[in-house]
């Protein structure tokens, strides 16, 4: 059984629900940002397309002592079917622009949205 | 305690040519990659250049590519930014970077001014 209410034992998270989860979690970030997001901090953008949430991870990752984005790196660790390290790209990821990590959050999000509107959950 | 101090800005015509310099303490400079980023007046922050620990790596802004070079000393725990056929658009306050940290562990910046 999966978890219903709280009362059944807890089983996998539909990709569904995890993929919701992670956009709330994105939306909350956004509509909480008072000082820039993780003091201005800047990534590599990724293509968002094949293997997304594993170059997100790689992106994010590599960003420490920003506890906003700690929940969101935890997140998308459970979508990426390989264990992500700080320094670590997979050849998927051209490293061609860095942005800063509040940008980063808010394409992230805005593709997100669209894929859950899709009933794209993988 | 991290500290980064940039030198180097100046005003420099069109075309011209500008080095800017990094001295990097407080943290082993050789272990981590480093940013360029810059900022425009009344602008936000863009990113200009990134280089890989070791030198051999590095990345450029497609704004840049081809004029500026991006370079590193660890043994001066130096990194520097050669800028070539400034343009005006250039004009900004750039800022070296530990990479993917805040400014809280950014240098203060040394303005460059592209103008004739």
């Known amino acids: 059984l999966t978890c219903l209410g709280g009362f059944a034992s807890p089983g996998p998270v539909p990709p569904s629900t995890a993929l919701r989860e992670l956009i709330e979690e994105l939306v909350n970030i956004t509509q909480n940002q008072k000082a820039p997001l993780c003091n201005g901090s800047m990534v590599w953008s990724i293509n968002l397309t094949a293997g997304m949430y594993c170059a997100a991870l790689e992106s994010l990752i590599n960003v420490s002592g920003c506890s906003a984005i700690e929940k969101t790196q935890r997140m998308l660790s459970g979508f990426c079917p390989h264990k992500v390290s700080a320094g670590q790209f997979s050849s998927l990821h051209v490293r061609d622009t860095k942005i800063e990590v509040a940008q980063f959050v808010k394409d992230l999000l805005l593709h997100l949205k669209k894929l859950f509107r899709e009933g794209q959950f993988n | 305690e991290v500290q980064l101090l940039e030198s180097g800005g100046g005003l420099v015509q069109p075309g011209g040519s500008l080095r800017l310099s990094c001295a990097a303490s407080?943290?082993?400079?050789?272990?981590?990659?480093m940013d360029w980023v810059r900022q425009a007046p009344g602008k936000g922050l863009e990113w200009v250049s990134s280089?890989?620990?070791?030198?051999?790596?590095?990345w450029y802004a497609d704004s840049v590519k081809g004029r500026f070079t991006i370079s590193r000393d660890n043994s001066k725990n130096t990194l520097y930014l050669q800028m070539n056929s400034l343009r005006a658009e250039d004009t900004a306050v750039y800022y070296c970077?530990?990479?993917?940290?805040?400014?809280?562990?950014w240098g203060q910046g040394t303005l460059v001014t592209v103008s004739s």
């Open positions: 280089i890989g620990p070791s030198g051999s790596e590095t």
């Open positions: 970077a530990k990479a993917y940290t805040g400014f809280g562990y």
């Open positions: 407080g943290f082993t400079f050789r272990d981590y990659e």
